[in-house]
């Protein structure tokens, strides 16, 4: 009786079974009752990375400089090439097909997380205490200065954008 | 149990043809692929043509395609291998094999076919 | 076509001895070979296929090894009865193809 169902990496073709091709190979023909799957290497720039009966090899993606795009890890005949983006740069989706310049956080705002080559800056408000008077992508909100431990006195109250101003303390006359 | 017994060889003449036959018996001839290969008088085997179960597919080596045909009848469970244009380099014991496993498991005791003039 | 080379040609050996058969392949068949037997006046016999797997009825003293380009068959102890030609032969593509033999004879 000729099968129905193929063991695990095999397939059905013609009333028989017939091995899939390893990762790195392209199927070149069927087997038959005489011969099994012929198989070739994948070439140069191209890849395969299941077991298949794929007739053509996959091109390596092509991490274009002119997206902003370097490669992170170089394909092999069984993986693909993987891009990142260059410095100051990050990916627009999961696939890294395209990259935009890092988010800068604007004043009143501080660095909460440094963008990676596939995540964006994230911003926070700078709390009470705190400011910001830079748009940055690196820099986090920093401290009030503390006029009492130089002995001085606030002169100008500091806001999420401003410092404060310190001052000398009125002396008495 | 499985047996193959070829018949039809002989002295021919090149150019001549000749018909050479293949009655199977001991298993579901109807089943396997089938095989017929040669074997030059004190030389190595050589493969000479296949056909698959149902005789849909035949497959030849470039030294005999368009000379050779072989074929089958699964009703009278018997192999068949047409010759034709035959030449003394054809001169050989040729044997029929059943593909059993992508293997020839089985083989009969083969037919002498001498090309001579 | 895929060319299957067998050496040594001739292996003279005595009963008992282990003999060890080569069949190299020009390209890589995977492990898409099978060892055959063939006495002197007999048709040849099936002795393992898939480049390892032993036949029923093929006494364990045959053992064939290898995958790639390079093949072995192995006999451990050499009986009489096993002084024949033994032929590779690659179904990893047509044309189906055999290698010369290799005859193992009585020293």
């Known amino acids: 009786e000729p099968p129905t169902a193929c063991r695990e990496k095999q397939y059905l073709i013609n009333s028989q079974c017939c091995s899939l091709c390893q990762p790195g190979q392209k199927l070149v023909s069927d087997c038959t009752e005489f011969t099994e799957t012929e198989c070739l290497p994948c070439g140069e720039s191209e890849f395969l990375d299941t077991w298949n009966r794929e007739t053509h090899c996959h091109q390596h993606k092509y991490c274009d400089p002119n997206l902003g795009l370097r490669v992170q890890q170089k394909g092999t005949s069984e993986t693909d090439t993987i891009c990142t983006c260059e410095e100051g740069w990050h990916c627009t989706s999961e696939a890294c097909e395209s990259c935009v310049l890092h988010r800068s956080c604007s004043p009143g705002f501080g660095v909460k997380q440094i963008a990676t080559g596939v995540s964006d800056t994230i911003c926070e408000p700078c709390p009470v205490g705190f400011f910001s008077n830079v748009s940055s992508a690196f820099e986090k909100c920093h401290p009030w200065t503390s006029c009492e431990t130089k002995d001085l006195v606030v002169q100008q109250a500091g806001t999420n954008k401003t410092d404060v101003v310190c001052g000398p303390q009125d002396r008495l006359r | 149990e499985v047996q193959l017994v070829e018949s039809g060889g002989g002295v021919v003449q090149p150019g001549r043809s000749l018909r050479l036959s293949c009655a199977a018996s001991?298993?579901?001839?109807?089943?396997?692929?089938m095989s017929w290969v040669r074997q030059a008088p004190g030389k190595g085997l050589e493969w000479v043509a296949s056909?698959?179960?149902?005789?849909?597919?035949?497959y030849y080596p470039d030294n005999v395609k368009g000379r050779f045909t072989i074929s089958r009848d699964n009703s009278k469970n018997t192999l068949y291998l047409q010759m034709n244009s035959l030449r003394a380099e054809d001169t050989a014991v040729y044997y029929c094999t059943r593909a059993g496993g992508k293997a020839m498991d089985y083989w009969g005791q083969g037919t002498l076919v001498t090309v001579s003039s | 076509e895929i060319v299957l080379t067998q050496s040594p040609a001739t292996l003279s050996l005595s009963p008992g001895e282990r003999a060890t058969l080569s069949c190299r392949a020009s390209?890589?068949?995977?492990?898409?070979l099978h060892w055959y037997q063939q006495k002197p006046g007999q048709s040849p016999r099936l002795l393992i296929n898939?480049?390892?797997q032993s036949i029923s009825g093929i006494p364990a003293r045959f053992s064939g090894s290898g995958s790639g380009t390079d093949f072995t068959l192995t006999i451990s102890s050499l009986e009489p009865e096993d002084f024949a030609v033994y032929f590779c032969?690659?179904?990893?593509?047509?044309?189906?193809?055999f290698g010369q033999g290799t005859k193992v004879e009585i020293k």
């Open positions: 032969q690659q179904f990893n593509s047509w044309p189906l193809t």
């Open positions: 056909i698959s179960s149902g005789g849909d597919d035949t």
């Open positions: 390209q890589s068949i995977r492990d898409n």
């Open positions: 898939y480049a390892s």
């Open positions: 001991g298993f579901t001839f109807s089943n396997y692929g």
